[in-house]
Amino acid sequence: MSFFFLSFHISNLQFNSSLEDPSTDYYQELQRDISEMFLQIYKQGGFLGLSNIKFRPGGGGGSVVVQLTLAFREGTINVHDVETQFNQYKTEAASRYNLTISDVSVSDVPFPFSAQSVD
């Protein structure tokens, strides 16, 4: 498997402490939307899932920073393509999920980054 660490800002959402409690409505609904979004972006094949999703406040606390790990079948995608496909989906993310995405960053994760299973 290949793993990629991805970070991005959601500039039209306000961070609050509910995003530090994984049992709240806000956390669960945002996690669900993001999980669905990634299934849409990488549905062409090779995408195995995402894990270790984490929300934190953006600069000044006026946005949400999302950090997560993506898993793909070995050799099906590289860092450049992960980032390109994600950036190409930004407009649809805004219309379908009402998420305004910016400041995308993708990097390789050396295997094994952890033994935790992918959700």
Epitope: S17, S18, E20, D21, P22, S23, T24, D25, Q28, S51, N52, I53, K54, S114, A115, Q116, S117, D119
Partner: antibody, heavy 116, light 110 residues
Framework: EVQLLESGGGLVQPGGSLRLSCAAS????????MSWVRQAPGKGLEWVSG????????YYADSVKGRFTISRDNSKNTLYLQMNSLRAEDTAVYYC?????????WGQGTLVTVSS | QAVVTQEPSLTVSPGGTVTLTCGSS?????????ANWVQEKPGQAFRGLIG???KRAPGTPARFSGSLLGGKAALTLSGAQPEDEAEYYC?????????FGGGTKLTVLR
């Protein structure tokens, strides 16, 4: 002052039912996720169930899934746990706890004894 | 269901430093497990100390700190006081449920 007061415990036969309540005061109950946690005699803690602030999301330990139901009434500042098909291994003190930052506030607990 | 492991018991001298750890059967503990630490003292209500790996609950003394250490969640007590003698439980979040560890009995030597 934050207070959580559990009630509804007691002695029940195996297969029976009980409904626990947790009355909350001293904070804005409707904005907090809540949990039930239990402690069997002489044992450690076991998380039982949790519920999001509006009740839209509920969570259960595998050991109680399908038998217990968590709910809340935000107008009454009260958390509930409906326990059906009770077993001897459900015998414990049941606590309600507020989540943020380390299950920060707990009640004093209510004892549930399942025995014939 | 995952299993969460803690040291059964630890001892510290007054004024000393001790680290309690919390491991997961599924692998390395990460910030997405939102590690929690709860204190139990006989005759008192349970008290949450740390949530979200490293955030102190209101009223938690600064001598308690939470972190990730070597693939585990950790609770470090710096400058132990006699009143810190207690049972300490960690809890980890796994996607849709919490799992508590078995607890660590911390003794502060007299």
């Amino acid at each position: 002052e934050v207070q959580l007061l559990e009630s509804g415990g007691g002695l029940v036969q195996p297969g029976g039912s009980l409904r626990l309540s947790c009355a909350a005061s001293g904070f804005t109950f409707r904005v907090y996720a809540m949990s039930w946690v239990r402690q069997a005699p002489g044992k450690g803690l076991e998380w039982v169930s949790g519920i999001s602030e509006t009740g839209s999301y509920t969570y259960y330990a595998d050991s109680v899934k399908g038998r217990f139901t968590i709910s809340r009434d935000n107008s009454k500042n009260t958390l509930y746990l409906q326990m059906n098909s009770l077993r001897a291994e459900d015998t414990a003190v049941y606590y309600c706890a507020r989540y943020p930052y380390g299950f920060d506030y707990w009640g004093q607990g209510t004892l549930v004894t399942v025995s014939s | 269901q995952a299993v969460v492991t803690q040291e059964p018991s630890l001892t510290v001298s007054p004024g000393g430093t001790v680290t309690l750890t919390c491991g997961s059967s599924t692998g390395a503990v990460t910030t997405s497990n939102y590690a929690n630490w709860v204190q139990e003292k006989p005759g008192q209500a349970f008290r949450g100390l740390i949530g979200g790996t490293n955030k102190r609950a209101p009223g938690t003394p600064a001598r308690f700190s939470g972190s990730l250490l070597g693939g585990k969640a950790a609770l470090t007590l710096s400058g132990a006081q006699p009143e810190d003698e207690a049972e300490y439980y960690c809890a980890l979040w796994y996607s849709n449920l919490w799992v508590f560890g078995g607890g660590t009995k911390l003794t502060v030597l007299r």
